[in-house]
Each structure stands twice: as structure tokens, then as C-alpha cells.
Interface confidence: low
């Protein structure tokens, strides 16, 4: 079967990296460069990505395959393939459409993506807080307070924080 | 001047097929990928199918694939998406689009392309 399709078809020969050339009466010729073709019997090579502006090389283009982006530091992917590139922002903030805004207290973010989530309620687990969270970390819960030993406390819940750079009214 | 224009789209019963034109004018088609995205009510415009210029590497959102089918015919200069097993959420007005020859963007943000059509609207409902 494969050598009758051959006999039909020119083209199926072609390997990945080469393309069936119509101008040279179906000779298979390599891929121009930043071009590529990841199968064989293709009549054209596809242009390479080019990972420009935000975006930098993870993977060269090859005459088989495709460039692979990653983001300029500062920035993550996004997407599939890295299709777009986001401003990373510190521990404790998430990305808003102002910018990077400061975790509102009782939440938090401890990666540099993402957005704030809620800090644990220990309470729900009939337990106590350990830690107290902050805008980059979760609080840590302890043990019950019923399990604790006499004498022993737990850390208090903190009481409603100031938003940074407020002082005292 | 370049110029866009949709056709095909209509209402379909879930489970039925629809089959979009784009006849593109004014420039070299076969130089060019081509893309088509859509957009629902109150929704942003989502792509849904690219394919390169060679008509060799093609790109497909997660929730078409193997169902819609993006194809040109560069000697027509006509795009084509052909859909089957439509679904309710399928509804949208889909757009075709020429990429550009260079963009900072992947293909599957609407920054990489240059120049739309108008839109033709697909209906999918009992």
C-alpha cells in the first residue's frame, strides 16, 4: 500500500524537515531558513515562531519543529503554548487591571502569579491558630484548644489590621 | 484594499452541521495564516481554529476539536470551518481573520491578527 500511495503521490516521501517543491517537479527540498515541517509530505514549511518583545527562546526553531517562548523575567506564561506573557508581581499582591495591588488582610498570595486567596479558617477544623497569617503567607493552624495542655494558649486571632502605609486617624 | 467576508452561518438544531466561508480580497491570500474566532453575548472573542499559510500546521481550541475542521483554498482565496455536532454552546458570531507577519502575540490572541471580517452568526437551539 505504501509504495502504490508513493507511486501516486511523490510527496508522501518527503520527510519532516523538507517540503514537496511543485516549482522542481515534486523534489523534496529542505525547509528555507525559520521555517520548519513536523511531518513529512507537507507541500509548504510553516514560518518559525518568533519569540520577540516580552517573549524569549526556550527552543530554537529546528527544521522539524516549532520554536518554544517563555517570558522575560518579570513575566510568566499564560495560555496554551505560552500564548501570552503576564507581569509577575511580589508575594503578597495580585495582578488587578491598575497594576499589582497589595492582598487584602485576611488573604493572601505567596506566589509571585495568581490572585489573593482567603487565609485557612482553623476554626472550621475545630482548631486553633498556630501562626498568624499575612498578606504572603496562610495562617498555620494548631491543635485544638481543648487539646491543649494547662497553662498552654494559643495564638489569638490578630484583630483587623491597618491597610499599609494608613496611620492612626 | 483588504477585505473580509463571512458567509454561511444560520440556525442549526444541536447535532447539526454548518460550514462558514471567508472570501478574502485585495492582497496575497496564500501568504498569510488565517484564523477564525467567535464571540458569544456578553463574552470576550475567543479563538476557535488557525491555520497556517502552507495550509500544514493547523491549531484548534480545546472544545472543537474533532468536531470543527478549518481548511483555505488559496487558488479561491477562501477560508473555510467546517462545523458538525454543533451544541448550544457553540452559538456565537464567528470571525475570520488574516495573522500578521509578525506579532509579539501566540495565534490564539487577537492581537496577532490584523484585519477581520464582519462576523456571520451561528444559532444553535432546539
Known amino acids: 500500500f505504501e509504495r502504490t500511495r508513493s507511486l501516486q503521490d511523490p510527496c508522501s516521501n518527503c520527510p519532516a524537515g523538507t517540503f514537496c517543491d511543485n516549482n522542481r517537479n515534486q523534489i523534496c527540498s529542505p525547509c528555507p531558513p525559520n521555517s520548519f515541517s513536523s511531518a513529512g509530505g507537507q507541500r509548504t514549511c510553516d514560518i518559525c515562531r518568533q519569540c520577540k518583545g516580552v517573549f524569549r527562546t526556550r527552543k530554537e526553531c529546528s527544521s522539524t519543529s516549532n520554536a518554544e517562548c517563555d517570558c522575560t523575567p518579570g513575566f510568566h506564561c499564560l495560555g496554551a503554548g505560552c500564548s501570552m506573557c503576564e507581569q509577575d508581581c511580589k508575594q503578597g499582591q495580585e495582578l488587578t487591571k491598575k497594576g499589582c495591588k497589595d492582598c487584602c488582610f485576611g488573604t493572601f498570595n505567596d506566589q509571585k502569579r495568581g490572585i489573593c486567596r482567603p487565609w485557612t479558617n482553623c476554626s472550621l477544623d475545630g482548631k486553633s491558630v498556630l501562626v498568624n497569617g499575612t498578606k504572603e503567607r496562610d495562617v498555620v493552624c494548631g491543635p485544638s484548644p481543648a487539646d491543649l495542655s494547662p497553662g498552654a494558649s494559643s495564638v489569638t486571632p490578630p484583630a483587623p489590621a491597618r491597610e499599609p502605609g494608613h496611620s492612626p486617624q | 484594499e483588504v477585505q473580509l467576508l463571512e458567509s454561511g452561518g444560520g440556525e442549526v438544531q444541536p447535532g447539526g452541521s454548518l460550514r462558514l466561508s471567508c472570501a478574502a480580497s485585495?492582497?496575497?491570500?496564500?501568504?498569510?495564516?488565517m484564523a477564525w474566532f467567535r464571540q458569544a453575548p456578553g463574552k470576550e472573542r475567543e479563538f476557535v481554529s488557525r491555520?497556517?499559510?502552507?495550509?500544514?500546521?493547523?491549531d484548534y481550541v480545546e472544545s472543537v476539536k474533532g468536531r470543527f475542521t478549518i481548511s483555505r483554498d488559496n487558488a479561491k482565496n477562501t477560508l473555510y470551518l467546517q462545523m458538525s455536532s454543533l451544541r448550544a454552546e457553540d452559538t456565537a458570531v464567528y470571525y475570520c481573520?488574516?495573522?500578521?507577519?509578525?506579532?509579539?502575540?501566540?495565534?490564539?490572541?487577537?492581537?496577532?491578527?490584523?484585519?477581520w471580517g464582519q462576523g456571520t452568526l451561528v444559532t444553535v437551539k432546539p
Open positions: 491555520l497556517a499559510w502552507s495550509g500544514g500546521s493547523t
Open positions: 481573520a488574516r495573522q500578521r507577519s509578525y506579532s509579539r502575540y501566540d495565534i490564539r490572541t487577537p492581537q496577532t491578527y490584523d484585519y
Open positions: 485585495g492582497w496575497a491570500f496564500g501568504n498569510y495564516g
